[in-house]
């Protein structure tokens, strides 16, 4: 059968019909509807929104829409005992206190249930002590402090600026350095773009604005009390002392007005270099402690938040496939927000809503996709990707056998400059081909393709005439699908022209000022960038669900595997003597990559030539494509990170947001010169090369002719 017959398609029911049905005005209306009150995970408001979305998806025409609930560990401030930080004098009197909440944005003064800024999952505590400024609290910042400057953070409260890396990594690093508390703040250098007004007059962060966020180090575990298994009605829960990833020291976030008051008194060592200075009018002294006049003053944290097992709700919608109903293409994004969620997540949820509506319209006209499409509105993403992870844990057997692809749909915008895509190499060609067919929304690119504006504004560092596509890291709901289950995944959004500030987010990220008005006034008044993102995300889902042959190109994996092998080899070659001493060879890895390249090339040739009218052969070839990503999964996982099982990619051990290639080898090599037992350390490098080489070779063999 042809594609049209197979999916009961009429000539007008094609990708164009689906894309033409997507409307910017609808996305705008949906965004407004989703952002009028807070939708914090675990609250009644977010449950009501789940039921509203369930009802609307049913109206839009999905075959079924169900709520999937779980009881997971969440964290909330104490309503009667607020969190704050103070400067205390020698008598213990509080001479300065940080703000208890953010000044509300215009029009929202009377909204109740705005959660004040807090670091989710911080333990309770009231530590007091001297302050040490630790820059971004990255691994390299603590190396600089401890090794070069000989500054000991043990028993100190550290203050770190947000940005560059995931906040959970900052807290982990501070804990390892012996700190007894962490203060996180937003420096204007990272969250105030020059020449732009602060909200409500522009998209910059006001001095009283604060970034919320969780500070877990879950490493893909999901609910901290039920790692590996769903947090259902009969779940066995760990005790809090055995919970995964919880921080052990109090943590609290503040804005730059309050940070100014803490940092202006800092004494001790001067900053080591200009990269440690932000934009506040303070010396950025490292400490420890305050300068002479204020040396008897200390900093005291007052943290009273509580961890509570709370019910969360995912919304799961199904559009059954006509030909291969047992093959799932998943489009998912979260629904829960820290406050109003103007960008994160509702700019993404509004796009998903419009994609569902468009698919529903086609279905009502008699069309079905070839494969089943699952739509998900995840809960509790902000508390550690909990909703998506619990659902995937509950459905892991189905997903590992039937999961074709997962497309993530969190924030549609983090700027309005150009497209940003992170995905598996299997999707490179799909993304390239799709963006060549879409119109660019960018000024100066009228009548040009999205591919052209994207390539011009964000060129690939390796291949001229092609756009940059990044590795998948984590910090979003694709994590469990890609890093744990090995389902081909991708994400797309519009981003800023701020390559140097890649992981700091937009200025109002996770603050009370992330409102509908922020988007409508400053980022995307015509909602044209939202529409483009809807076309990219929706177009990817359409192709993945409807193309006869899956739109995966295994040759692109071969190309990146060679690049990653070269990169990790060059890192190792910084230690030529040790490689010789311990007989470290990358020959097996390069050999496996060479084999993969040859087998992928032959597979691609067969893919061009086979009889697509033979459903058995078609299914066989598609299964080889679908299971290729799965073949990179090591069932034993990475060292000390059992839920990160992808051998080619994992979130960086130093920054959850960033992706690392050959992470097992990378981590074994990291800081190897400081290891107390070099023989053991280089032995682990060799073991990781072995695991990587074996996995690449095994993956290659899944593409060989089956008999």
């Amino acid at each position: 059968k042809s594609s049209n017959e197979a999916t009961n398609i009429t000539p007008k029911h094609n990708m164009k019909a689906f894309l033409d049905e997507l409307k910017a005005e609808n996305i705008k209306k949906f965004l407004y509807n989703f952002t009028q009150i807070p939708h914090l995970a675990g609250t009644e408001q977010n449950f009501q929104l789940a039921k509203q979305i369930q009802s609307q998806w049913k109206e839009f025409g999905l075959d079924s829409v169900e709520l999937a609930h779980y009881d997971v560990l969440l964290s909330y401030p104490n309503k009667t005992h607020p969190n704050y930080i103070s400067i205390i004098n020698e008598d213990g009197n509080e001479i300065f206190n940080t703000s208890l909440f953010e000044p509300p944005p215009p029009g929202y003064e009377n909204v109740s249930d705005i959660v004040p800024p807090f670091s989710a999952f911080s333990p309770q505590g009231m530590p007091e002590g001297d302050l040490v400024y630790v820059n971004y609290a990255r691994t390299e910042d603590f190396f600089k402090l401890e090794r070069d400057m000989k500054i000991n953070c043990s028993g100190k409260i550290v203050i770190a600026r947000y940005g560059k890396v995931f906040r959970g990594n900052k807290v982990k690093n501070a804990q390892l350095a012996g700190a007894k508390g962490v203060i996180l703040y937003s420096d204007p250098a990272d969250y105030f773009a020059p020449g732009v007004k602060s909200y409500p007059d522009g998209w910059n962060l006001p001095g009283g604005g604060v970034q919320r966020g969780n500070i877990l180090n879950l490493n893909g575990a999901g609910d901290p009390l039920t790692p590996g298994y769903p947090a259902n009605e009969y779940a066995y829960r760990r005790g809090i002392a055995e919970a995964v990833g919880l921080p052990s020291i109090p943590v609290h976030p503040i804005g730059y007005y309050d940070a100014q008051k803490l940092l202006e008194k800092m004494g001790g060592s001067a900053p080591p270099d200009s990269s440690w200075r932000g934009s506040l009018k303070v010396p950025y002294n490292v400490g420890p402690g305050f300068t002479g006049n204020f040396s008897t003053q200390k900093v005291k944290m007052h943290i009273h938040s509580t961890n509570e097992v709370t019910r969360i709700y995912n919304v799961i919608g199904t559009l059954r496939g006509a030909v291969e109903p047992d093959r799932y293409v998943i489009l998912g994004g979260h629904r829960d927000s820290w406050v109003f969620g103007g960008i994160d997540p509702q700019s993404g949820a509004a796009v998903v809503h419009e994609i569902v509506r468009s698919f529903g319209t086609l279905k009502k006209e008699g069309w079905r996709p070839r494969r089943t499409i699952l739509f998900a509105s995840w809960d509790a993403e902000e508390f550690g990707l909990l909703g998506s992870t619990e659902w995937a844990e509950e459905n892991s057997r189905l997903l590992q056998e039937r999961g074709v692809a997962y497309i993530n749909a969190d924030s549609s915008i983090e700027g309005n400059y150009t497209l940003r895509v992170d995905c598996t190499p299997l999707m490179y060609s799909l993304v390239h081909n799709l963006t060549k067919e879409l119109k660019s929304p960018d000024e100066g690119f009228e009548g040009k393709s999205l591919y052209e504006s994207w390539t011009k504004k964000s060129p690939s560092p390796e291949f001229s005439g092609m756009p940059r596509i990044s590795k998948l890291g984590s910090g979003n709901d694709f994590e469990v699908f890609f890093q744990r289950l090995g389902i081909a995944s991708g994400r797309a959004r519009y981003t800023k022209n701020w390559e140097t500030n890649k992981f700091s987010g937009y200025p109002l990220y996770h603050s009370v000022y992330e409102t509908y008005e922020l988007v409508e006034k400053f980022y995307d008044p015509m909602f044209k960038y939202h529409l483009t993102v809807a076309q990219v995300r929706g177009g990817m889902v359409f192709e993945l669900a409807n193309s006869i042959v899956l739109p995966f190109d295994c040759r692109d994996y071969a190309v990146v595997l060679r690049k990653y092998a070269d990169k990790i080899y060059s890192i190792s070659m910084k230690h030529p003597q040790e490689m010789k001493t311990y007989s470290v060879s990358f020959d097996s890895l390069f050999s496996a990559v060479k084999n993969f390249t040859e087998i992928a090339s032959k597979f691609s040739e067969r893919l061009q030539d086979f009889d697509k009218s033979n459903p058995i052969v078609l299914r066989m070839m598609n299964d080889q494509l679908m299971f290729l990503e799965r073949a990179f999964i090591d069932p034993l996982g990475l060292p000390d990170r059992p839920f990160y099982r992808h051998v080619i990619y994992a979130p960086s051990s130093h920054n959850k947001y960033a992706g690392e290639s050959f992470p097992g080898i990378y981590d074994a090599l990291f800081d190897i010169e400081s290891k107390v037992d070099p023989s053991k350390a280089w032995g682990e490098v060799k073991r990781q090369i072995y695991v990587a080489a074996f996995t690449v070779q095994a993956a290659a063999e899944t593409l060989s002719e089956v008999a």
Epitope: F96, N97, T98, F101, P103, S198, Y199, D201, G207
Partner: antibody, heavy 119, light 107 residues
Framework: EIQLQQSGPELVKPGASVKMSCKAS????????MHWVKQNNGESLEWIGY????????RYNQNFNGKATLTVDKSSSTAYMQLNSLTSEDSAFYYC????????????WGQGTSVTVSS | DVQITQSPSYLAASPGETITINCRAS??????LAWYQEKPGKANKLLIH???TLQSGIPSRFSGSGSGTDFTLTISSLEPEDFAMYYC?????????FGGGTKLEIK
């Protein structure tokens, strides 16, 4: 030196209107909000509203909706407040004051304009 | 609207003394309270904002403290030029509102 120079005292009849001015100098006029505050003789202060010259947004205290109208002339860095349908209740001192942003306190004030409503 | 209650409304003290003026908000205003000084024939002066931040150029004998609903202005070692009218004002939520004022006179 930053200054907010307000216009002179006004004696007006009930039912009439009055328009007072506040000329700013020593800073970039469009970078700061301009607020207006009422003070009844020897009594406390009441915030009337603001004009933001950066984007021409205004916000009023509901108590002054329809009573006060705030405008600016950016070319002369001057803010204006018009009060209409005047009654004896409107007899007061009126101050202009600037703030750096929406959430910031008023760091510089004018010397005030006296308005007396009397027949 | 946020109501601000200021006390006392009248205070007599001598130069060199330390005095305190209190303001209470009808609901939590975090730390967003400002203090102003008013003198006849002079423009009002911002002394303190955000509860405890001293405005540049203001002598350090002025200090502010408090958070939530209760705030205090302290003037230590009163100088002759400090005898004036003082107002507090919340600057977190529009419409901005003021306390009733405190008249500080020489004893």
């Amino acid at each position: 030196e930053i200054q907010l120079q307000q216009s002179g005292p006004e004696l007006v009849k009930p039912g009439a209107s009055v328009k007072m001015s506040c000329k700013a100098s020593g800073y970039t006029f469009t970078d700061y909000y301009m607020h207006w505050v009422k003070q009844n003789n020897g009594e406390s202060l009441e915030w009337i509203g603001y004009f933001n010259p950066y984007n021409d947004y205004t916000r009023y205290n509901q108590n002054f909706n329809g009573k006060a109208t705030l405008t600016v002339d950016k070319s002369s860095s001057t803010a204006y407040m018009q009060l209409n349908s005047l009654t004896s209740e409107d007899s007061a001192f009126y101050y202009c004051a600037r703030s750096d942003g929406y959430y910031d306190a008023m760091d510089y004030w004018g010397q005030g304009t006296s308005v007396t409503v009397s027949s | 609207d946020v109501q601000i209650t200021q006390s006392p409304s009248y205070l007599a003290a001598s130069p060199g003394e330390t005095i305190t003026i209190n303001c209470r908000a009808s609901k939590s205003i975090s730390k967003y309270l400002a203090w102003y000084q008013e003198k006849p024939g002079k423009a009002n002066k911002l002394l303190i904002h955000s509860g405890s931040t001293l405005q540049s150029g203001i002598p350090s004998r002025f200090s502010g403290s408090g958070s939530g609903t209760d705030f205090t202005l302290t003037i230590s070692s009163l100088e002759p030029e400090d005898f004036a009218m003082y107002y507090c004002q919340q600057h977190i939520e529009y419409p901005w509102t003021f306390g009733g004022g405190t008249k500080l006179e020489i004893k």
